[in-house]
């Protein structure tokens, strides 16, 4: 990661409150669970919850902790240390190209295909022709059978940490 | 005592470019948050940016993100602030200063001009 | 236009006190410090409070800060004539993730 952080996602802390640990920089950087004070002097320890940082660094501030968007389940709360991890509900997906909303998955394939992959929460099922087994653009159809599918179980998160 | 000298003002126009910089003395310089703060003539304070004591960390205002670069020179003491694409808006004087949330030393300022 | 909120002006008798209020959001004021500056005209800002509350050496007792939810207040005492001057509240903004200050208000000691 690039040790250049410009504003995005900073969290609302400043000085540090009397209950928040501080420890010293080392070579003018503070581990991860902490940001630096303004004069350099002190490593100031992120809030449980409301903010992170996962590397070294010598940030003004934490970073904000992610919240999970409705229709989104919460794998891993946000520590210290680490985002949280947010996952499309069952029956939802997130596109690479459309990550900021999950989408409902297809109940089924076009004509002429046949499923051969289940809705996961990081993918719509999978349909391929039934002659050549070539794959399905991915448009929803304009008229669909009554092949129908279960959503997938989750398997591996789809993490929004920063 | 601390002390924040601001230099590189002067006349520019539109879509020039300038560098500001300030000499800071009186304290151990290289730990420091460091902001660039503005006031055009006649109006309030505006924030411009901050920079880490490494330069690791650097914030900048939207008015002026893209156009304008913070950086720090530890070994000389210095805050630099570049400035390109300049509009007739950032037309004020530029304060340097101590820390960043709530700088607590300001430099007497040096003032740039665009117009054409 | 100020993401804080100043009055424009504020006067007093010497010898009278004044109070200048700082009107902000949960975003600024209500989860992070306030500073106090003064500027007198062609000087740069001076910083009278940090931290809400606290007073930089140098700077004398007649001027306090407060903070309450999203509002901030400096009060100044036995208002002097070299009082007269622009005084302005900043802290920083988490959604902007800015340094904000308020427009500014003008003391002046009738």
């Known amino acids: 990661e690039s040790a250049l952080i410009t504003q995005q996602d900073l969290a609302p802390q400043q000085r540090a409150a009397p209950q928040q640990k501080r420890s010293s920089p080392s070579e003018g950087l503070c581990p991860p669970g902490h940001h630096i004070s303004e004069d350099g002097r002190d490593c100031i320890s992120c809030k449980y919850g409301q903010d992170y940082s996962t590397h070294w660094n010598d940030l003004l501030f934490c970073l904000r902790c992610t919240r999970c968007d409705s229709g989104e389940v919460e794998l891993s709360p946000c520590t210290t240390t680490r985002n949280t991890v947010c996952q499309c509900e069952e029956g939802t997906f997130r596109e690479e190209d459309s990550p900021e909303m999950c989408r409902k998955c297809r109940t089924g394939c076009p004509r002429g295909m046949v499923k051969v992959g289940d809705c996961t929460p990081w993918s719509d099922i999978e349909c391929v022709h039934k002659e050549s087994g070539t794959k399905h653009s991915g448009e929803v159809p304009a008229v669909e059978e009554t092949v129908t599918s279960s959503p997938g179980t989750p398997a591996s998160p789809c993490s929004l940490s920063g | 005592e601390v002390q924040l000298v601001e230099t590189g003002g002067g006349l520019v126009q539109p879509g020039g470019s300038l560098r500001l910089s300030c000499a800071a003395s009186?304290?151990?310089?290289?730990?420091?948050?460091m902001s660039w703060v503005r006031q055009a003539p006649g109006k309030g304070l505006e924030w411009v940016s901050a920079?880490?004591?490494?330069?690791?960390?650097?914030y900048y205002a939207d008015s002026v993100k893209g156009r304008f670069t913070i950086s720090r020179d530890n070994s000389k003491n210095t805050l630099y602030l570049q400035m390109n694409s300049l509009r007739a808006e950032d037309t004020a004087l530029y304060y340097c200063?101590?820390?960043?949330?709530?700088?607590?030393?300001w430099g007497r300022g040096t003032m740039v001009t665009v117009s054409s | 236009q100020s993401v804080l909120t100043q009055p424009p002006s504020v006067s007093a008798a010497p010898g009278q006190k004044v109070t200048i209020s700082c009107s902000g959001s949960?975003?600024?004021?209500?989860?992070?410090?306030v500073s106090w500056y003064q500027q007198v005209p062609g000087t740069a800002p001076k910083l009278l409070i940090y931290?809400?509350?606290k007073r930089p050496s140098g700077i004398p007792d007649r001027f306090s800060g407060s903070k309450s939810g999203t509002s901030a207040t400096l009060g100044i005492t036995g208002l002097q004539t070299g009082d007269e001057a622009d005084y302005y509240c900043?802290?920083?903004?988490?959604?902007?993730?800015?340094?904000?200050f308020g427009g500014g208000t003008k003391v002046t000691v009738l």
């Open positions: 200063a101590r820390g960043a949330s709530g700088p607590d030393y």
């Open positions: 009186g304290f151990t310089f290289s730990p420091y948050y």
């Open positions: 920079i880490s004591g490494s330069g690791g960390s650097i």
């Open positions: 949960t975003s600024n004021i209500g989860n992070n410090y």
């Open positions: 931290d809400n509350n």
């Open positions: 900043g802290t920083w903004d988490s959604s902007l993730s800015a340094l904000v």
